[in-house]
């Protein structure tokens, strides 16, 4: 099943202590999906979308960006035929970077 879209939601972090907000959206025909956020292949957080909506926002409190690993990806799962879980492809990666200090 198709990959979700992924994006950072503003305000963007300006330091490693700032929170990070990552939105993941499934295609329109998959409302109420279960979403998983990964960083460097490791599970960071799981969220379920409301039954009438197709997206979730992962809210990572300050310090999450210090964790080792690569960019963030998300994935969603839905119940298919025979109540079997079907997983989507992974989203494109999204990277979190911080502004270079001006001093």
């Amino acid at each position: 099943i198709p990959a979700p879209s992924i994006r950072l939601v503003p305000p963007y972090p300006s330091s490693q202590e700032d929170p990070i907000h990552i939105a993941c959206m499934a295609p329109g025909n998959f409302p109420g999906a279960n979403f998983t956020l990964y960083r460097g292949g490791q599970v960071v957080q799981l969220l379920q979308a409301p039954t009438d909506q197709r997206g979730v926002t992962f809210n990572l409190s300050g310090g999450s960006s210090k964790a080792p690993g690569g960019p963030f990806h998300c994935q969603y799962g839905v119940l298919g035929e025979l109540n079997q879980s079907q997983l989507s492809d992974l989203s494109e990666p999204v990277n979190v970077s911080f502004p270079v200090p001006t001093w």
Epitope: E17, P19, Q53, G62
Partner: antibody, heavy 123, light 112 residues
């Protein structure tokens, strides 16, 4: 349900500092799904975002007001506060505090508002 | 002058459909940032009407709907009612300068 209530003086003298507090009831200010913000509305005019704060203390300010604004949070009291320095008559407005929602694949909407408090800058 | 441009006023008769536009640029709506809409009845605080371009909070009638295309967004109200007479504001994020949440200048809706 969550409610927000602004408090503070309704009259401030020019060049002084405007100080307001927003008390959150019916829910925790420490939820990861929300920022907490201040918005103002001069009489007969539109809305202007002042700034927002996360429970951890991370702040974001309107660039046009940044040099004069400080927003702080007190999680133990479930409150956040606004300080606006060097005020002039142009800062006369209704000041609202609001909750900023992050969820459903979106973010940044002011989903719950206080009733607003009128602040007049005059000598 | 607001970063997001709205018509100062619109009007319609009861039962009609009206739309309110919100025109931005490539640094806000055109950059795919979420658009939110608010209704402000006279003498009251604004109320969230639409968030994330199209999503209605619980309790908001389905007569209200939002859409977005390119650098513009629209709020549509069908089956206009007298109690819809209010000011309406759009809001988004603008990435120019240091980044900022921005509001449109507001649109006064009159029900004839």
């Amino acid at each position: 349900q969550v409610q927000l209530q602004e408090s503070g003086p309704g009259l401030v003298k020019p060049s002084e500092t405007l100080s307001l507090t927003c008390t959150v009831s019916g829910g925790s200010i420490s939820s990861s799904s929300y920022y907490w913000g201040w918005i103002r509305q001069p009489p007969g005019k539109g809305l202007e975002w002042i700034g927002s704060i996360y429970y951890s203390g991370s702040t974001h300010y309107n660039p046009s007001l940044k040099s004069r604004v400080t927003i702080s949070v007190d999680t133990s009291k479930n409150q956040f506060s606004l300080k606006l320095s060097s005020v002039t008559a142009a800062d006369t407005a209704v000041y609202y505090c609001a909750r900023v929602y992050y969820g459903s694949g979106t973010g940044g909407a002011f989903d719950i508002w206080g009733q607003g408090t009128m602040v007049t800058v005059s000598s | 002058q607001s970063v997001l441009t709205q018509p100062p006023s619109v009007s319609g008769a009861p039962g009609q459909r009206v739309t309110i536009s919100c025109t931005g640029s490539s640094s806000n709506i055109g950059a795919a940032y979420d658009v939110h809409w608010y209704q402000q009845l006279p003498g009251t605080a604004p109320k969230l009407l639409i968030y994330g371009d199209t999503i209605r909070p619980s309790g908001v009638p389905d007569r209200f709907s939002g859409s977005k295309s390119g650098t513009s967004a629209s709020l549509a109200i069908t089956g206009l009612q007298a109690e819809d007479e209010a000011d309406y504001y759009c809001q988004s994020y603008d990435s120019s300068l240091s980044g900022s949440w921005v509001f449109g200048g507001g649109t006064q809706l009159t029900v004839l």
